[in-house]
């Protein structure tokens, strides 16, 4: 093949070199740009910095390598659209360090940064983790900091990413308040902070205020569905970012809803309670209250993360006739209390009949089964009905 | 134990060169990076540039970028520094100083060299 | 590059005083070290990352502080330690040092 005059030229199905000395000092327009899965980038002293836009379109890019160039900045989202790198090679430039938020997202199996004049500080902790920690093939570089000494020797006891306290109202807070929440952040270096409140939605309107080192958020007429919702307070720095999380506790009444009872491998008879604090439980039967037993026990189901009701069972234990009856749950909290009632009948009491009505016995001449000619009771297969009344 | 030792004073007129050596001793010179410093009279510290005597590879100041050199003979296990086109203001106490990366600072200084420069 | 600014630039004080010396960044930085110097003689570590005390320094010599903000703090001034102390940073390319702090006998 005749030798490409150009200062990329393709290479395989999905590469692209460039390496004609000092052609290049962008990488806007590469040519097949959607389609690369390599791209191999020497002697280009005039590329000197690698942003977000240098590599829009290269979502393919698996293989990135520019070396022996003039890289000096590649900035912390100039990987954003190469969600698929796996191999960064950006040996023997003139990079003094590289932002923990470069490599954020990617699973890079190998990063290479021998031959850069590195400057140790508290920036390339995320590398020197990297190296204590054998990822990336980072160790077998022995990577050096210009002036100093090897990365591996860095201090790093001052090397913290922030720390984060987030003050919640210690009083209690009942719907159609407003909460002011306030997020310290500490630590050195603080690049930027902020609070995530993704789960909030309909919970209640949200005011931000203040800055750096102190974030405040309104919560203006939450409601009760703001119980069990992060709100997340985030800081960055260049060591890395610290997240802390806080609920905010509505206080309202209990509530409660009983169902219709259903056969599982023991009976139970659902329910639903709802409240903050979680409301206390007390079960009656035919209006006296029922203790439990190990054959008659409450059981919840495992409750959603984000939310305050809770979903149980009454269990019974194969339940006779003399279970049949009216339960009713009530549930309590400091701000109300609520019941609800269900009459459940698990099976037919088998002495109810006149004593001059004939007893209903069936009997099975050619019945083989039976060593004897005695009479075979047969069970009543006639499914029974249970009607409910939801409170 | 570990030592740096400086060569004697020197004075130039403007426009001329000096070169200033630090014999190391007492460590494995070319394991440490060695750094230059310059001290004028009454004033702070100003650092200059670095040298690392295992592969020569060396950083500067933007101030002193084309007018500084810095070498090394690992042979003496001696490290150089020269400063061309001198003005009066170079007229200081330069300083060579190890980087202890065990510690991470520069924890052995040389006694100091003075040019004075001159006409 | 990051500026360092000490202070106070000159200070008199007596045997057995207690001491504090402030260095400032122009932006925040990863460690500090400190330096004494005497007249006509090389300087002297006395701390390195903030707050490690440099070999042979005695423990009256305390260092503290992070990001923009450091103190070196001398807990019982004796006669050997009048002389001047530099601050350095070196979070980024240059090295940079504090103007000096001068102290003085009373």
């Known amino acids: 093949a005749a030798p490409c005059p150009d200062a990329c030229c393709p290479h395989g199905s999905s590469g692209l070199r460039c390496t004609r000395d000092g052609a290049l000092d962008s990488l806007h327009h590469l040519p097949g740009a959607e389609n690369l899965t390599e791209l191999y980038i020497e002697n280009q002293q005039h590329l000197q910095h690698l942003e977000l836009r240098d590599l829009r379109g290269l979502g393919e890019l698996r293989n990135l390598t520019i070396v022996k160039s003039g890289l000096r900045f590649v900035a912390p989202d100039a990987f954003h659209f190469t969600p698929r790198l796996s191999r960064l090679n950006l040996s023997f430039n003139a990079l003094e360090s590289l932002s923990w938020k470069t490599v954020q997202g990617l699973s890079l199996q190998e990063l290479v940064l021998s031959g850069n004049p590195l400057h140790c500080s508290c920036a390339l902790r995320w590398l020197q983790r990297w190296e204590e920690e054998g990822l990336g093939g980072v160790p077998e570089q022995k990577l050096q900091c210009h002036g100093q000494g090897p990365l591996a020797h860095m201090p790093n006891a001052s090397c913290g990413v922030p720390t984060l306290k987030v003050q919640v109202p210690n009083a209690s807070v009942d719907v159609g308040d407003d909460v002011l929440l306030r997020c310290q952040v500490e630590g050195r270096g603080l690049e930027q902070a902020g609070w995530i409140l993704t789960e909030l939605e309909q919970s209640a309107t949200v005011m931000k205020s203040g800055g750096l080192p102190s974030l405040g958020l309104t919560l203006a007429n939450v409601t009760s569905d703001l119980n069990r919702k992060n709100v997340t307070c985030w800081a960055e720095n260049d060591v890395g970012r610290a997240e802390v999380s806080v609920q905010v506790n509505v206080s309202f009444p209990a509530s409660v809803q009983l169902h219709t009872a259903v056969e599982m491998h023991h009976w139970c008879i659902p329910f639903s309670v709802d409240g903050q604090p979680a409301p206390s439980l007390r079960w009656l039967f035919n209006g006296s209250v029922l203790n439990e037993t190990s054959f008659i026990f409450t059981e919840f189901l495992e409750p959603a993360a984000n939310e305050t009701v809770r979903h149980g069972c009454l269990r019974l234990n194969q339940p006779t006739h003399v279970n049949n009856g009216n339960y009713t749950l009530l549930a309590a909290n400091p701000f109300g209390q609520a019941s609800a009632s269900i009459m459940a009948a698990f099976m037919d009491n088998p002495f109810e009949f006149n004593p001059e009505d004939p007893i209903p016995v069936s009997f099975s001449p050619v019945d083989t089964n039976s060593t004897s000619g005695d009479p075979v009771e047969k069970k009543d297969e006639t499914p029974f009905g249970v009607s409910v009344a939801v409170g | 134990q570990v030592q740096l030792v400086q060569s004697g004073a020197e004075v130039k007129k403007p426009g001329a060169s000096v070169k200033v050596s630090c014999k190391a001793s007492g460590y494995t010179f070319t394991t440490y990076w060695m750094h230059w410093v310059r001290q004028a009279p009454g004033q702070g510290l100003e650092w200059i540039g670095t040298?690392?005597?295992?592969?020569?590879?060396?950083s500067f100041a933007q101030k002193f970028q084309g007018r500084v050199t810095l070498t090394r003979d690992t042979s003496t296990s001696t490290a150089y520094m020269e400063l061309s086109s001198l003005r009066s203001e170079d007229t200081a106490v330069y300083y060579c100083?190890?980087?202890?990366?065990?510690?991470?600072?520069?924890?052995?200084w040389g006694q100091g060299t003075t040019v004075t420069v001159s006409s | 590059d990051i500026q360092m600014t000490q202070s106070p630039s000159s200070l008199s004080a007596s045997v057995g005083d207690r001491v504090t010396i402030t260095c400032r960044a122009s932006?925040?930085?990863?460690?500090l070290y400190w330096f004494q110097q005497k007249p006509g003689k090389a300087p002297k570590p006395l701390i390195y990352?903030?707050?490690s005390l440099g070999s042979g320094v005695p423990s009256r010599f305390s260092g503290s502080g992070s990001g923009t903000d450091y103190t070196l703090t001398i807990s019982s001034l004796q006669p050997e330690d009048f002389a001047t102390y530099y601050c350095?940073?070196?979070?980024?390319?240059?090295?940079?040092f504090g103007g000096g702090t001068k102290v003085e006998i009373k």
């Open positions: 100083t190890r980087f202890y990366f065990e510690d991470w600072y520069f924890d052995v």
């Open positions: 040298i690392y005597p295992g592969n020569s590879d060396t």
């Open positions: 932006s925040s930085i990863s460690w």
């Open positions: 350095q940073q070196w979070h980024s390319y240059p090295p940079t």
């Open positions: 990352y903030t707050s």
